[in-house]
């Protein structure tokens, strides 16, 4: 069944994507694109990393985790209804046809009108510590820990299961990882 990630208009949305570098600082290029992953490359690129740094990003799209440790999860700032749709995380693993690609479906809901502040129950609110610092250098926020190594199908599935705040709260101190190399 299709998995959805949800956020409300005006909030930040979070789309998880992780890998484990083969060695510290031995990074793999990653691109994020709007729209389903094409078979080659990324289309409609909103953010791209190379072997060392974030080398391209567009307004409102950024990485808040420590991408040098393989947390390449995408944050979209101050979302609108137009941000709904499929996003592609492509991990460009070196070698012939080794790329791993994941489609993540983002659904933006109209903002709730509530008379008094209540605890938010959407996906983004489950990750407040990951949404507090903007920057493209080493993340100033605490990074996710690691679960035991799992295969790429499992990471996609596990990442998909982070879609509601209950699961997100349960898993907020863990993270699915892909080990490269």
């Amino acid at each position: 069944s299709e998995v959805e990630y949800r956020a409300e208009v005006g909030q930040n949305a979070y789309l998880p994507c992780f890998y484990t570098p083969a060695a510290p600082g031995n990074l793999v290029p990653v691109c994020w694109g709007k729209g389903a992953c094409p078979v080659f490359e990324c289309g409609n690129v909103v953010l791209r990393t190379d072997e060392r740094d974030v080398n391209y990003w567009t307004s409102r799209y950024w990485l808040n985790g420590d991408f040098r440790k393989g947390d390449v999860s995408l944050t979209i700032e101050n979302v609108t209804l137009a941000d709904s749709g499929i996003y592609c995380c492509r991990i460009q693993i070196p070698g012939i046809m080794n790329d791993e690609k994941f489609n993540l479906k983002l659904v933006i809901k109209p903002a709730k009108v509530t008379p008094a502040p209540t605890r938010q129950r959407d996906f983004t609110a489950a990750f407040p510590r990951m949404l507090t610092t903007r920057g493209h250098g080493p993340a100033e926020t605490q990074t996710l820990g690691s679960l035991p190594d799992i295969n790429l199908t499992q990471i996609s599935t596990l990442a998909n299961e982070l879609r509601d705040s209950r699961l997100a709260n349960d898993l907020r101190d863990s993270g699915a990882t892909i080990r490269i190399g």
Epitope: S1, N44, M97, N103
Partner: antibody
Framework: QVQLKESGPGLVQSSQTLSLTCTVS????????VGWIRQPPGKGLEWIAI???????YYNSALRARLNINRDTSKSQVFLEVNSLHTEDTATYFC?????????????WGQGLMVTVSS | DVVLTQTPSTLSAIIGQSVSISCRSS???????????LYWYLQRPGQSPQLLIY???NLGSGVPNRFSGSGSGTDFTLKISGVEPEDLGVYHC?????????FGSGTKLEIK
């Protein structure tokens, strides 16, 4: 407008190397990928290789050992070499554009070039 | 490699008739987000192929809406609702999720 055109020899001897050129206009090779697909007479299509917009290369594993693809972005040309030719390599060779989105995969094609490999 | 099996290999239709072509894959062409990487191309006689349908059910640019695609997983169908004379040619399905990309053997549509 977008155009792709294949050029190269129409007849090649077996065991020789086939060198094909795809010259494109109406778009930049740094924004779009260009792939090669062939069609033996009366048969179906077979994907050969692609040079992506970012310069990455992907090959059909069944042909990989005999293939080389590269490009000259300044001349808007993509080149395909097929070596150690067999008569089964006789086909119409198409170059085609990959727009790097799912809705533009092979959205424009060249007219095709018929290549005969003789023994 | 992914094997795509197209049926029938040849199809005869009269103008205005509705026809369907089947494409079956040896592996699933859908991912966990429900995206299905199946494409349909039409190759008219003596011409290059042209994109008809992408992602199983989306109409390519400038393609008449008498063409429609459906299916997910491993079973797919292309339907032409009311065949026109310009529809004759060979229809190819292609999968775009696994490298190498592979095509079906083609279905030739003839006009009676």
């Amino acid at each position: 407008q977008v155009q792709l055109k294949e050029s190269g020899p129409g007849l090649v001897q077996s065991s020789q190397t086939l060198s094909l050129t795809c010259t494109v206009s109406g778009f930049s090779l740094t924004n779009y990928g260009v792939g090669w697909i062939r069609q033996p007479p009366g048969k179906g299509l077979e994907w050969i290789a692609i040079m992506t917009s970012g310069g990455s290369t992907y090959y059909n594993s069944a042909l990989r050992a005999r293939l080389n693809i590269n490009r000259d972005t300044s001349k808007s040309q993509v080149f395909l070499e097929v070596n150690s030719l067999h008569t089964e390599d006789t086909a119409t060779y198409f170059c085609t554009r990959d727009g790097t989105t799912v809705e533009t995969l092979f959205d424009y094609w060249g007219q095709g070039l018929m290549v005969t490999v003789s023994s | 490699d992914v094997v795509l099996t197209q049926t029938p290999s040849t199809l005869s239709a009269i103008i205005g008739q509705s026809v369907s072509i089947s494409c079956r894959s040896s592996q699933s062409l859908s991912d966990s987000a429900g995206i299905t990487y199946l494409y349909w191309y039409l190759q008219r006689p003596g011409q290059s192929p042209q994109l008809l349908i992408y992602l199983a059910s989306n109409l390519g640019s400038g393609v008449p809406n008498r063409f429609s695609g459906s299916g997910s997983g491993t079973d797919f169908t292309l339907k032409i609702s009311g065949v026109e004379p310009e529809d004759l040619g060979v229809y190819h399905c292609m999968q775009g999720i696994h490298v190498p990309l592979t095509f079906g053997s083609g279905t030739k549509l003839e006009i009676k």
